[in-house]
Amino acid sequence: GSERTCCPVNWVEHERSCYWFSRSGKAWADADNYCRLEDAHLVVVTSWEEQKFVQHHIGPVNTWMGLHDQNGPWKWVDGTDYETGFKNWRPEQPDDWYGHGLGGGEDCAHFTDDGRWNDDVCQRPYRWVCETELDKASQEPPLL
């Protein structure tokens, strides 16, 4: 594919990445699928500066990000190292809480109303943010 040099319509450019903000909610897996089919991924937060940017755009609304521990350890969807990377959890989080009565624990991370992160049940229908990097080769096909 060709190199992407500007953001698609309805996406917001910031620091050589493009961001798309949903207006409705989906389960984490459906949000993840949506972003991947847009040749993107759920947002990966790598700095305080990026955290502030995303927080400004989403407002005080629970919003999925590309961080989960569905297979054990916490992982970013793009392979960014979790252990050494930026984190902004709420106090006492993540707690893998089982008391919600929905079965299982809490395996997917989201921005809370104050921007800090919480782990929650992945089936909850939260808003989501997609991110794609400028300068990466676009996999997007032509309009067939």
């Epitope: 698609p8 207006r23 989906k26 699928n33 309009l143």
Partner: antibody, heavy 113, light 107 residues
């Protein structure tokens, strides 16, 4: 609640054209990619076409390329399928689906002379 | 293109039985698979997404498992309303593809 309502089906002669519509309500339409999926009488489900939420990315089943055109109007919460050069083997119930989550009830297209 | 196969193509079972349907992909599709139920004359309905997540509002007797190329749909205790045809659908890559379906009818 979520509703997807297809319309535009009917009887058409081979070589003819039809335009199917799908009206969505109960969802934020622009937050969903959309698909057309069809089912020939007594047969299984067959994916037809995909359009991304913005309309900038489109895919078709290989067998349909050049004859069918998918489009959407987010301002009208509507999805469309323009079908040209129709053949008897295109006879099917055509469903629209939001992501792969929600399905409409379908509209029957019959291609026969 | 990714081919999806399902087995069995049909099965007869009784109310209360445990039923398992298998879907295989011709190449790895992560967990990008859903299970859909269709009753005669009706539109399909999604039961399971991401291979193992239960769609909101779907009874907990339905469950899904698997990743990569092999997936299963299980119904722990078959109910009268579960007699239907079940399809798997991969949405990992285009073209999206369905399995040929498994018809579950009354023994």
């Amino acid at each position: 609640q979520v509703q997807l309502v297809e319309s535009g089906g009917g009887l058409v002669k081979p070589g003819g054209s039809l335009r199917l519509s799908c009206a969505a309500s109960g969802i934020t339409f622009s937050d969903y990619y959309m698909n057309w999926i069809r089912q020939a009488p007594g047969k299984g489900l067959e994916w037809v076409s995909y359009i991304s939420s913005s309309g900038r990315t489109i895919f078709y089943a290989d067998s349909l390329k050049g004859r069918f055109t998918i489009s959407r109007d987010n301002a009208k919460n509507s999805l469309y399928l323009q079908m040209n050069s129709l053949r008897a083997e295109d006879t099917a119930v055509y469903y629209c689906a939001a992501d792969t989550i929600y399905w409409g009830q379908g509209t029957l297209v019959t291609v026969s002379s | 293109d990714i081919q999806m196969t399902q087995s069995p193509s049909s099965l007869s079972a009784s109310v209360g039985d445990r039923v398992t349907i298998t879907c295989r992909a011709s190449q790895g599709i992560r967990n990008d698979l859903g299970w859909h139920q269709q009753k005669p004359g009706k539109a399909p309905k999604r039961l399971i997404y991401a291979a193992s997540s239960l769609q909101s509002g779907v009874p907990s007797r339905f469950s899904g498992s698997g990743s990569g190329t092999e997936f299963t749909l299980s119904i722990s205790s078959l109910q009268p309303e579960d007699f239907a045809t079940y399809y798997c659908l991969q949405h990992n890559s285009f073209p999206f593809t369905f399995g040929p379906g498994t018809k579950v009818d009354i023994k």
